[in-house]
């Protein structure tokens, strides 16, 4: 099994500019989880979908913050527009 | 029913602490994130502070960072503001808030802080 | 931080009257929400993601707008409608609120 797999791998952009990150989470998973680590700020659950639908998605109050999982293999995050402080290493993560 | 009620509030002299309480029933508090906002007497909404479901996801006014702790105890269905090193200008009417539709949805009544000599 | 600017800050209008209130953010925005607020009373959720109308709101309420403008309008005023109305974006943290607009009967 190849793990969750995301992509890009690594991405930057200029302030403004919309970022769309894309996670294909591990086959038979029925969960999966947007994370956000920063070293001010640590490890954040921005949202979370069970069966393609969103569970909770209070780690991203900002509306420019958007995430969808049309279907039970592929989910996006997107941020527009993007901010400096959006800087930072993004977790997709799935469980059974 | 959703409701929010809050407490804690009341005179405090400057340079004082007070700890607002928020008591939410009527949803499942822990599947929802969590706002603090004030208004000043005669004054407009100010936002104060944001906490996710799950405590991970904090944010503040940047005029309020080292003063204002927000947190929260899913177990007991309650939102926390710890106010410390109070000023004449903290005083205010302390609303607690759902967060719904990335919008504030349900609001309490608002307890009333003063900060006087 | 994007500065929330309503306008009017006060509007005196009549029964029946379509009133306009304008939110303009000094930094374009994705969306605006609306609130109401009475005397004493805790703010009431109105409209959100811009245009949306929140559960129990009448249809006379209405909203519009994109980038920095955005618009909130009362089709026809009812006497449960004198209030102060707030826009505030949630784009981007600190969640700033305009300075209200104090609707008053005329």
């Known amino acids: 099994d190849a793990g969750v797999i995301q992509s890009p791998r690594h991405e930057v952009t200029e302030m403004g500019q919309e970022v769309t990150l894309r996670c294909k989470p591990i086959s038979g998973h029925n969960s999966l989880f947007w994370y956000r680590q920063t070293m001010m700020r640590g490890l954040e659950l921005l949202i979370y979908f069970n069966n393609n639908v969103p569970i909770d998605d209070s780690g991203m109050p900002e509306d420019r913050f958007s995430a969808k999982m049309p279907n039970a293999s592929f989910s996006t995050l997107k941020i527009q527009p993007s901010e400096p402080r959006d800087s930072a290493v993004y977790f997709c993560a799935s469980s059974l | 029913e959703v409701q929010l009620v809050e407490s804690g509030g009341g005179l405090v002299q400057p340079g004082g602490s007070l700890r607002l309480s928020c008591a939410a029933s009527?949803?499942?508090?822990?599947?929802?994130?969590m706002h603090w906002v004030r208004q000043a007497p005669g004054k407009g909404l100010e936002w104060v502070s944001y906490?996710?479901?799950?405590?991970?996801?904090?944010y503040y006014a940047d005029t309020l960072k080292g003063r204002f702790t927000i947190s929260r105890d899913n177990s007991k269905n309650t939102l926390y503001l710890q106010m410390n090193s109070l000023r004449a200008e903290d005083t205010a009417v302390y609303y607690c808030?759902?967060?719904?539709?990335?919008?504030?949805?349900?609001w309490g009544q608002g307890t009333t802080v003063t900060v006087s000599s | 931080d994007n500065q929330l600017t309503q306008s009017p800050s006060f509007l005196s209008a009549s029964v029946g009257d379509r009133v306009t209130i304008t939110c303009r953010a000094s930094?374009?925005?994705?969306?605006i929400y609306w609130y109401q607020q009475k005397p004493g009373k805790a703010p009431k959720l109105l409209i959100y993601?811009?245009?949306n109308l929140a559960p129990g709101v009448p249809s006379r309420f209405s909203g519009s707008g994109s980038g920095n403008e955005y618009t909130l309008t009362i089709s026809s005023l009812q006497p449960e409608d004198f209030a102060t109305y707030y826009c505030q974006q949630f784009t981007s943290s600190p969640f700033t609120f305009g300075q209200g607009t104090k609707l008053e009967i005329k």
């Open positions: 930094s374009s925005v994705n969306y």
């Open positions: 808030a759902r967060r719904g539709e990335k919008a504030m949805d349900y």
């Open positions: 906490i996710s479901s799950g405590s991970s996801t904090i």
């Open positions: 993601y811009t245009s």
């Open positions: 009527g949803f499942t508090f822990s599947n929802f994130g």
